[in-house]
Amino acid sequence: NQDLPVIKCVLINHKNNDSSVGKSSSYPMVSESPEDLGCALRPQSSGTVYEAAAVEVDVSASITLQVLVDAPGNISCLWVFKHSSLNCQPHFDLQNRGVVSMVILKMTETQAGEYLLFIQSEATNYTILFTVSIRNTLLYTLRRPYFRKMENQDALVCISESVPEPIVEWVLCDSQGESCKEESPAVVKKEEKVLHELFGTDIRCCARNELGRECTRLFTIDLNQTPQTTLPQLFLKVGEPLWIRCKAVHVNHGFGLTWELENKALEEGNYFEMSTYSTNRTMIRILFAFVSSVARNDTGYYTCSSSKHPSQSALVTIVEKGFINATNSSEDYEIDQYEEFCFSVRFKAYPQIRCTWTFSRKSFPCEQKGLDNGYSISKFCNHKHQPGEYIFHAENDDAQFTKMFTLNIRRKPQVLAEASASQASCFSDGYPLPSWTWKKCSDKSPNCTEEITEGVWNRKANRKVFGQWVSSSTLNMSEAIKGFLVKCCAYNSLGTSCETILLNSPGPFPFIQDN
C-alpha cells in the first residue's frame, strides 16, 4: 500500500541512575543505543495495525517506547493503556520525522500490559501495539559452579546450571596468600569452561549472569607447606561432586602420591594423577581425589601421602542440607560518641551465605572473611555513631539467619520543649536515659532553684525514633505556677541540659535553651 507511512518502533533502556529520564520529559535523552522493535503490519486485522516485538523489562527498570513516523504533514496521537487514554505529544526530529514517546519510569507489575498508540496523519489513521511484560527473574537462577573431569582428557570442566546461561571463567593465581586477591596482578582470568593447566597454586571457577557472580575454589592440599595443626574441613551436600587436589613439588621425579579415606586407599576411578616439570626442573605432581556424587558415607578424613613429604589430611563432611550456625541472641552495645566500634557476627555456613546489614530500613553491603578455624566473620563499622537497631541477615539455598544489635551512644541529653494551655512537656534523647527535674523561677528564686515535684509525670523511653530511645517529662499546669518561668532539666552521667519555659496564658510559648 503506497499510502502507508514508514514506521520505526524502538525501545530505549535507561540506566537506573540516568538523570535524563524525568517525569516531565516526554522524550528523554537516549542513554543506551535504541533497540529496533520491528513494527510489522499485523495481517488479517481490521484497520491498519502495526505490532512491535514484545518488550521484556526488569522490575524497576526505566524505558522509553518510541515511534518514528516518516509521513508528510502533521500528526496527532493518543496512547491507550488499560482502557485509559494518556496524553501524547508528538514532535519532529532533525530528519523531520514525527517522534512519539512513552516513558515508563521504574517498571512495576501495574505498568505491564498492552500499550496502544493511535496515530492520525493527513493521509491515514493507524494503530501501533506494544506489549510490555516484566521479565520473570523468579525463573532466574545462579548456581555455584562445580567441577567435572573431561572425558578421556586430563582437564577439568566448570559447570554452573544457571538461567540465563552464565559466563564461566577460571581465575588462576600462582602466588601465595594475600597476592591472590581478585584484582591482584598475580591473578589470571580465562573465560572458558575447560581448564588444562591444573598445576597452579590457587584455582577457582566463577559463573556470572544477571543475578551476580558465584565462585568455587578447587580445594587444594599443598604438601610443600608444613601441615596445619588443625585439619581443614570441606563441606558438601549429598549429591554434590567432591574434588580435592593434592599437590607436591620435589627436586626429582622419585616420589609418589596416594589418597586414603580413613586409612583405606581410595578405589581406582576415584583419583587421577598428573605431573609436569617446572621451569627449574623440579617435578610437580598433582593427585585428584573425586567422587561424582557424594553420599553420607563419603564423610571422613581424606589423607594425601607422599613418599617424601609429610602427609596431610582434610575432613570432608557431607550434610543433607545447607546450614548457617551462629548465635542469634540479640546484642546491645554502649559506646562513646567518637569510639571506634564494629558489629561482628561469627558464623559457620555451607553453602556460602549472601548477607546484608540493615539500619533504619536502609541496607548496606555485607563483606565476609574466612577465619582459620572454619568460621567466617562479617563486620559492620559504617554506623556513623547513629544509635538504634542494626540487623544482620544471612541466607543460603537452605537456611536463613537474622541477628539483632542495639547501639547506644553515650551522650549528654539534648532537651526540646513544647507547651499547651494545660501542660508543658520536655523531651530528650541522650544515653544513658536521663532523669528529670523541674524548677520554678520566681522573685524568691531568681536562679530557678525551687524544685517542683507536684504534677510531674515522667515517661522513659516511650517511643523509638529509628531505634533511638526518647525520654519525656510533662508538667501539668497549676494556678501556683501559671505565669511563671519554669525550667526542665534532663541529666545523666555525661551532663545536664535544660530548657526554660514561660507558663503564661494561652498563646505562643517562648523557650529558652539553657545548657
Epitope: 585439619l231 613429604h309 596431610q312
Partner: antibody, heavy 118, light 111 residues
Framework: EVQLQESGPELVKPGASVKMSCKAS????????MHWVKQRPGQGLEWIGF????????KYNEKFKGKATLTSDKSSSTAYMELSSLTSEDSAVYHC???????????WGQGTTLTVSS | NIVLTQSPASLAVSLGQRATISCRAS??????????VHWYQQKPGQPPKLLIY???NLESGVPARFSGSGSRSDFTLTIDPVEADDAATYYC?????????FGGGTKLEIK
C-alpha cells in the same frame, strides 16, 4: 619399626649451651614433622616447638623462643635441639616426638636427661 | 594459652572395673568438625604413648578397652575393664591452638 633414638644424658654448667640429637629410623625422615617436648618431674609436659625436616620450617612456643633452636639433617635422618643460656630451670627430660597430622604425636623418643648444675 | 585441667589428679580402680578420667579445656578446642584433643599413657621411665587421637579415635595397636569421648571443652578417657598393665599416668593434650598444651596428668592405680 619406627624408632627415635635420643642422645645420652647431659650434665652442664649454668650459662652454657647443649645440643641434643634424635635419630629417626624405620620410616622416611622427611615424611613427618618432628616435635620436641620438655618434661620436668612433677611439672607435666611442655611443648617446645617443631621442625619440618622436608623444608626446615620451624615453629616455637613463645616461651622457648631464644632458648631452643631446632635443626635437622636429612642425610643422617637426625633432628637436633640446641638449648642456650642454661639455668637450673632447664633441667628436665627432653623428648623428640614424630607428629602425624591426623593423629598427633604417634612415636616418642625415650628422652634426653639434661641436668644444669654448677 | 589454653589450659587443660585433668581430674582427678589420681584414682585407684579395682581390676576389671571402669576408670574415667576427665579433661576440661579453658576454651573450645574444636575447629572445623574435629576436636583437637589427644590422650597419652606414660609409665615410669618410659616416654608417653599415644592412645586416642582427635578425641575419640583409637590409635592402631591400642586395646579397644580404651575409648575417648567429648567435644568443645569437655573430654573423657574411659578404660573399661581396667587391667593391671594400665597402671600409669594419663595425659590429655590439645593442638587446636598454639602453643600446644598438656593436662597435668592423672595417675591411675590398680587395686
Amino acid at each position: 619399626e619406627v624408632q627415635l633414638q635420643e642422645s645420652g644424658p647431659e650434665l652442664v654448667k649454668p650459662g652454657a649451651s647443649v645440643k641434643m640429637s634424635c635419630k629417626a629410623s624405620g620410616y622416611t625422615f622427611t615424611r613427618y614433622v618432628m616435635h620436641w617436648v620438655k618434661q620436668r618431674p612433677g611439672q607435666g609436659l611442655e611443648w617446645i616447638g617443631f621442625i619440618n625436616p622436608y623444608n626446615d620450617d620451624t615453629k616455637y612456643n613463645e616461651k622457648f623462643k631464644g632458648k631452643a633452636t631446632l635443626t635437622s639433617d636429612k642425610s643422617s635422618s637426625t633432628a637436633y635441639m640446641e638449648l642456650s643460656s642454661l639455668t637450673s630451670e632447664d633441667s628436665a627430660v627432653y623428648h623428640c616426638a614424630r607428629w602425624r597430622q591426623l593423629g598427633s604425636l604417634d612415636s616418642w623418643g625415650q628422652g634426653t636427661t639434661l641436668t644444669v648444675s654448677s | 594459652n589454653i589450659v587443660l585441667t585433668q581430674s582427678p589428679a589420681s584414682l585407684a580402680v579395682s581390676l576389671g572395673q571402669r576408670a574415667t578420667i576427665s579433661c576440661r579445656a579453658s576454651e573450645s578446642v574444636d575447629t572445623y568438625g574435629s576436636s583437637f584433643v589427644h590422650w597419652y599413657q606414660q609409665k615410669p621411665g618410659q616416654p608417653p604413648k599415644l592412645l586416642i587421637y582427635l578425641a575419640s579415635n583409637l590409635e592402631s595397636g591400642v586395646p579397644a578397652r580404651f575409648s575417648g569421648s567429648g567435644s568443645r571443652s569437655d573430654f573423657t578417657l574411659t578404660i573399661d575393664p581396667v587391667e593391671a598393665d594400665d597402671a600409669a599416668t594419663y595425659y590429655c593434650q590439645q593442638n587446636n591452638e598454639e602453643p600446644w598444651t598438656f593436662g597435668g596428668g592423672t595417675k591411675l592405680e590398680i587395686k
